[in-house]
């Protein structure tokens, strides 16, 4: 399992805000309600990326192919770019993914999974309050 400790979190955060977040919301758009229970959490940034990686790329019985979605492709590119050695760990996973059938419909289970992803990303980009305040005072 990849260790996300040495990733450039600020660069990943910027990529998320710029593109990935919009693709996640596009995926969720049109749903009547997004009030799924949050069952997945994370306690620090590396842990958040571990959970995001798992939910985005590991197929589950009722939601097999999120990895083909635009947000997943961008997530993969972002992690490959800003996490040293990440792309090497994904070669086997990518080869296995190519054998799977393409998703035909967005199932409620997939919507729930993407809702969980939005929650994990929100935790990941949560700025440390004290450090932000120090930065704010320093520059003003």
């Amino acid at each position: 399992m990849y260790d996300f400790t040495n990733c450039d979190f600020q660069k990943i955060e910027a990529d998320y805000l710029r593109t990935i977040s919009k693709d996640l919301i596009t995926y969720m758009s049109g749903t009547k309600s997004t009030d799924f229970n949050n069952t997945v959490s994370c306690s620090n940034r590396p842990h958040c990326l571990t959970e995001i990686q798992s939910l985005t790329f590991n197929p589950t019985p009722r939601c097999a192919s999120l990895a083909k979605e635009m947000f997943a492709r961008k997530t993969k590119a972002t992690l490959a770019l800003w996490c040293p050695g990440y792309s090497e760990t994904q070669i086997n996973a990518t080869q296995a993914m190519k054998k799977r059938r393409k998703r035909k419909v967005t199932t409620n289970k997939c919507l729930e999974q993407v809702s969980q992803l939005l929650g994990l990303w929100r935790r990941f980009i949560r700025t440390l309050l004290k450090k932000q305040l120090e930065h704010h005072h320093h520059h003003h």
Epitope: L17, M28, T34, D35, N44, I125, T127
Partner: antibody, heavy 121, light 111 residues
Framework: QVTLKESGPGILQPSQTLSLTCSFS??????????IGWIRLPSGKGLEWLAS???????YFNAALKSRLTISKDASKNQVFLKIASVDTADTATYYC?????????????WGQGTLVTVSA | DIVLTQSPASLAVSLGQRATISCKAS??????????MNWFQQKPGQPPKLLIY???NLVSGIPARFSGSGSGTDFTLNIHPVEEEDAATYYC?????????FGGGTKLEIE
């Protein structure tokens, strides 16, 4: 300048649906990280968090009340709506809406003045 | 939902003395080294007023006699020296996980 204002029916009868509106200005609910929360203070009791809705349309509810609550937004009109179904006298309270934020602005706190709702037969 | 248990439910403190209010969370409200715990003061007929954010940070304009401490699941609000205007109900609030939740409140009376 950030302002929030709650509006509601004032008085309603048991079993009716309570509809509340939070009208706000000074920020946009389309901005990343922004959200609105609904909170109530029943007479003689403590603050109770009811529900929240975020810029990305994610919604969260107090587990004990979830089956009765509906929250929605009209970001273009700067309004958030809360509905509570099948009200009882226990729902008599002052209802507040508040701006909630992730990240940088989390240390700010903006609340409306509250609107009193009385459930009475 | 994260449950916050506040104690005591009510507290009577002499003018100039120390008031200590405790808040225990059912699970950790820490993330990446910061505690997502707030403290509010509420007086009758008014909305709650934020005193402390991130467990120990004093909001601008709040007197220095208010202080917060703690991490993980155990948090404390201290008021010292207590003044007459501090008579109010105090609430802890966690903003670590949706839905946010409040403690049951502590009513502070000044003797």
């Amino acid at each position: 300048q950030v302002t929030l204002k709650e509006s509601g029916p004032g008085i309603l009868q048991p079993s009716q649906t309570l509809s509340l509106t939070c009208s706000f200005s000074g920020f946009s609910l389309s901005t990343y990280g922004m959200g609105i929360g609904w909170i109530r203070l029943p007479s003689g009791k403590g603050l109770e968090w009811l529900a929240s809705i975020w810029w990305d349309d994610n919604r969260y509810f107090n587990a004990a009340l979830k089956s009765r609550l509906t929250i929605s937004k009209d970001a273009s009109k700067n309004q958030v709506f809360l509905k509570i179904a099948s009200v009882d006298t226990a729902d008599t309270a002052t209802y507040y809406c508040a701006r909630i934020e992730d990240g940088y602005y989390s240390y700010h706190s903006y609340w409306g003045q509250g609107t009193l709702v009385t459930v009475s037969a | 939902d994260i449950v916050l248990t506040q104690s005591p439910a009510s507290l009577a403190v002499s003018l100039g003395q120390r008031a200590t209010i405790s808040c225990k969370a059912s699970q950790s409200v820490d993330f990446d080294g910061d505690s997502y715990m707030n403290w509010f003061q509420q007086k009758p007929g008014q909305p709650p007023k934020l005193l402390i954010y991130a467990a120990s940070n004093l909001v601008s304009g709040i007197p220095a006699r208010f202080s917060g401490s703690g991490s993980g699941t155990d948090f404390t609000l201290n008021i010292h020296p207590v003044e007459e205007e501090d008579a109010a109900t105090y609430y802890c609030q966690q903003i670590d996980e949706d839905p946010y939740t409040f403690g049951g409140g502590t009513k502070l009376e000044i003797e």
